[in-house]
């Protein structure tokens, strides 16, 4: 039985060049958190194993930073890393739980962070 | 080359014990999470155990807790599947498998299989 | 416990046919779905994950989609090779769970 849910920053936006944290918050559940995968559209960005530790996908490791917590950092951000985002949770014993967080980039100073949100 | 070779199967009485042995080779034993998969006579397959890469956690489907034990040796390259309180529903090939690091419950890679009778 | 229904259980085509094997999971999985192919007397080998990726080293005549509760995967101009029993898996909830698998014989 899943009962948990998945927080997240929800819709956010960031400055070209700058650095953004992507958040995910796992509650109201006891299941033990064994992974965290941190993926844009279908690719792999980052994992959090709870025995390994980080890995950064070979591709992403100069503009990706693990942390805070279970969080991932984007740094140098350009335009193109603008799109959505996914925490995957992997726990036992509940299973798969997917947070989404929609990143803007922008080319001006106007970035603003948006709601929190909930996903069950 | 992936290579999973499992031993230790045999014909067992109901309620009797038997130790199940995978030695690994061809990959970093100590980063995957490895599993065992039994196929039925009938040629179902059914998961039952995963240990985590560092042995940390260990997860099973309830038709088999509190009688099956999966640990591992990282030193020695191999995977355990002690089995105790056999039953006839238990009967099946064994199949060891390494699971894909980025997706826990994906089994990339299975080996030969070793086989379990449990008859009177 | 999810339960994976695969359709049909067998399957009979020929050669150069396209074929769909169908896999229903009883709540909804999301994209979390492996589809494993088993030759006769072989062991099982992993072909497709998160419902539409292929494996490394699987021929592209194979393909694999859906979410939620539907999934599908497809074999383009079948060869005498994918003569074979499939299993899809779904990977979003404990206890991890297995269709009862789709033979295809060749006409």
């Known amino acids: 039985m899943m009962t948990g849910t998945i927080e997240t920053t929800g819709n956010i936006s960031a400055e070209k060049g700058g650095s953004i944290i992507l958040q995910c918050h796992l509650s109201s559940t006891t299941a033990q958190v064994t992974q965290v995968n941190w993926e844009q559209q279908d690719q792999l960005l980052a994992i959090c194993n709870a025995d390994l530790g980080w890995h950064i996908s070979p591709s992403f490791k100069d503009r990706v930073a693990p942390g805070p917590g279970l969080g991932l950092t984007l740094q140098s951000l350009t335009v193109n890393d603008t799109g959505e985002y996914f925490c995957i949770y992997h726990t036992y014993p509940d299973g798969t739980y997917t947070g989404r967080i929609f990143l803007e980039v922008l080319e001006s100073s106007v970035a603003e962070h948006g709601a929190r949100f909930q996903i069950p | 080359e992936v290579k999973l070779v499992e031993s230790g199967g045999g014909l067992v009485k109901p309620g009797g014990s038997l130790k199940l042995s995978c030695a690994a080779s061809g990959f970093d034993f100590s980063r995957y999470d490895m599993s065992w998969v039994r196929q039925t006579p009938e040629k179902r397959l059914e998961w039952a155990a995963t240990?985590?890469?560092?042995?940390?956690?260990?997860y099973q489907p309830d038709s088999v807790k509190g009688r099956f034990t999966i640990s591992r040796d990282n030193a020695r390259n191999t995977l355990y599947l002690q089995m105790s309180s056999l039953r006839s529903e238990d009967t099946a090939l064994y199949y060891c498998?390494?699971?894909?690091?980025?997706?826990?419950?994906?089994?990339?890679?299975w080996g030969q299989g070793t086989s379990v009778t449990v008859s009177s | 416990d999810i339960q994976m229904n695969q359709s049909p259980s067998s399957l009979s085509a020929s050669l150069g046919d396209t074929i769909t094997i169908t896999c229903h999971a009883s709540q909804n999985i999301n994209v979390w779905l492996s589809w494993y192919q088993q030759k006769p007397g072989n062991i099982p080998k992993l072909l497709i994950y998160k419902a539409s990726n292929l494996h490394t080293g699987v021929p592209s005549r194979f393909s694999g989609s859906g979410s939620g509760t539907g999934f599908t995967l497809t074999i383009s101009s079948l060869q005498p090779e994918d003569i074979a029993t499939y299993y899809c898996?779904?990977?979003?909830?404990?206890?991890?769970?297995f269709g009862g698998g789709t033979t295809l014989e060749i006409k």
């Open positions: 898996q779904q990977g979003q909830s404990y206890p991890w769970t």
């Open positions: 498998a390494r699971q894909d690091y980025r997706y826990p419950y994906i089994m990339d890679y």
């Open positions: 240990i985590s890469s560092g042995g940390s956690y260990t």
